[in-house]
């Protein structure tokens, strides 16, 4: 009898533990933001990309905030940040201003409390895209593990924004919390 009660209690405790774990997991912040193709800046200079989707297609956000083109951290923690940026050009869309390109992405952290900005990750390459080639494509993927505090903001800068691939599976960035700060 008492053995049976103990087993039942353990099952109940276990389910509560599962529930607690699950609710904690559900509260884990994450974001996957995809490029808003209707609002990509033109030109070849380095610009901050401010238009991203957070609630359509592959884009999702939970317990983080997207505002003014920046992904805002709501919970302190260690986060994995990632960005994938694709550049492409087809001759039917126009000419290239120059065949020598620097195709870059910068993932930047801005702190509001102590006004400062830091590049967390950068990636890219110099490329020769001949005007005689019909099609060009180049992809950059960066990812890293960072301690982030509530209120800090993550933004993306790129060179040659007019060459961005506007598909949701091509140009995106995101973050997810991996663990608390001890």
């Amino acid at each position: 009898g008492s053995q049976h009660i103990r087993a039942e209690k353990a099952m109940v405790d276990g389910s509560w533990l599962d529930l607690a774990k699950r609710s904690k997991l559900e509260a884990q912040p994450f974001a996957h933001l995809t490029i808003n193709a209707t609002d990509i800046p033109s030109g070849s200079h380095k610009v901050s990309l401010s238009s991203w989707y957070h609630d359509r297609g592959w884009a999702k956000i939970s317990n983080m905030t997207f505002s003014n083109g920046k992904l805002i951290v709501n919970q302190d923690g260690f986060y994995y940040l990632y960005a994938n940026i694709c550049f492409r050009h087809h001759e039917t869309s126009g000419d290239l201003a120059t065949e020598y390109l620097q195709l870059m992405v910068y993932v930047t952290k801005t702190s509001i409390k102590i006004p400062s900005s830091h590049t967390l990750m950068k990636g890219g390459s110099t490329k020769y895209w001949s005007g005689n080639s019909e099609f060009h494509f180049y992809s950059i993927n960066v990812g890293g593990f960072f301690k982030l505090r509530s209120g800090e903001e993550i933004s993306i800068e790129v060179s040659n924004p007019s060459l961005l691939d506007p598909d949701q599976d091509a140009t995106y960035f995101g973050a997810f919390k991996v663990r608390d700060i001890d």
């Epitope: 030109g43 070849s44 000419d95 120059t98 005689n132 080639s133 019909e134």
Partner: antibody, heavy 118, light 111 residues
Framework: QVQLQQSGAELASPGASVKLSCKAS????????LQWVKQRPGQGLEWIGA????????KYTQKFKDKATLTADKSASTAYMQLNSLTSEDSAVYYC???????????WGQGTLVTVSA | NIVLTQSPASLSVSLGQRATISCRAS??????????MHWYQQKPGQAPKLLIY???NLESGVPSRFSGSGSRTDFTLTISAVEAEDAATYYC?????????FGGGTKLEIK
């Protein structure tokens, strides 16, 4: 549809300068090189150079480097070619032109006749 | 600079007959698997008109009697059955390399 509208005929004296214009419409002006071509009366076609109106990059045939200056006004979607130190050799029809969506010069202005005469 | 030499300089062809114009480049105009050679027709007092792009592609709206062939340095424009309206001067042009260049032209007369 793509259209290139060029300025009217010019009569100039030797040693003077002229500035020809080419107003583009029907496409995004800043995304294609705009080319200039010269044709002397009864002669063939000569490629002068081109301008990329976005950042204003230019390229010229060596022969025209000191003769022609290419500029563009993005806000007016207009390209310009200034010809300086005019001589009788510069009397010609000048065309502005743009490549097609694939290749080859598919779009041409109507041409501007420049006559250099004392 | 790439020099384009057209031949013949002038050509007289009877209505309904075939006309063939040649264009030879001083060096190859091929790159990335394509030939950067184009053909134009120009009538007196008019701007040139693109007929063939990338050596063999017929520009939209151009009659199918016009065709282009060739690669690297040797190219040909063919009019399969000449019509009266084809009387004009024909030019080849390369844009494989700056500066772009034109051939000297071939004047086609209809007999």
């Amino acid at each position: 549809q793509v259209q290139l509208q060029q300025s009217g005929a010019e009569l100039a004296s030797p040693g003077a300068s002229v500035k020809l214009s080419c107003k583009a419409s029907g496409y995004t002006f800043t995304t294609y090189w705009l080319q200039w071509v010269k044709q002397r009366p009864g002669q063939g076609l000569e490629w002068i150079g081109a301008i990329y109106p976005g950042p204003g990059n230019t390229k010229y045939t060596q022969k025209f480097k000191d003769k022609a200056t290419l500029t563009a006004d993005k806000s007016a979607s207009t390209a310009y070619m200034q010809l300086n130190s005019l001589t009788s050799e510069d009397s010609a029809v000048y065309y502005c032109a743009r490549r097609g969506s694939r290749r080859g010069i598919a779009y041409w202005g109507q041409g501007t006749l420049v006559t250099v005469s004392a | 600079n790439i020099v384009l030499t057209q031949s013949p300089a002038s050509l007289s062809v009877s209505l309904g007959q075939r006309a063939t114009i040649s264009c030879r480049a001083s060096e190859s105009v091929d790159s990335y698997g394509r030939s950067f050679m184009h053909w134009y027709q120009q009538k007196p007092g008019q701007a040139p008109k693109l007929l063939i792009y990338l050596a063999s592609n017929l520009e939209s709206g151009v009659p199918s009697r016009f065709s282009g062939s060739g690669s690297r340095t040797d190219f040909t424009l063919t009019i399969s059955a000449v019509e009266a309206e084809d009387a004009a001067t024909y030019y080849c042009q390369q844009d494989n390399e700056d500066p772009y260049t034109f051939g000297g032209g071939t004047k086609l007369e209809i007999k």
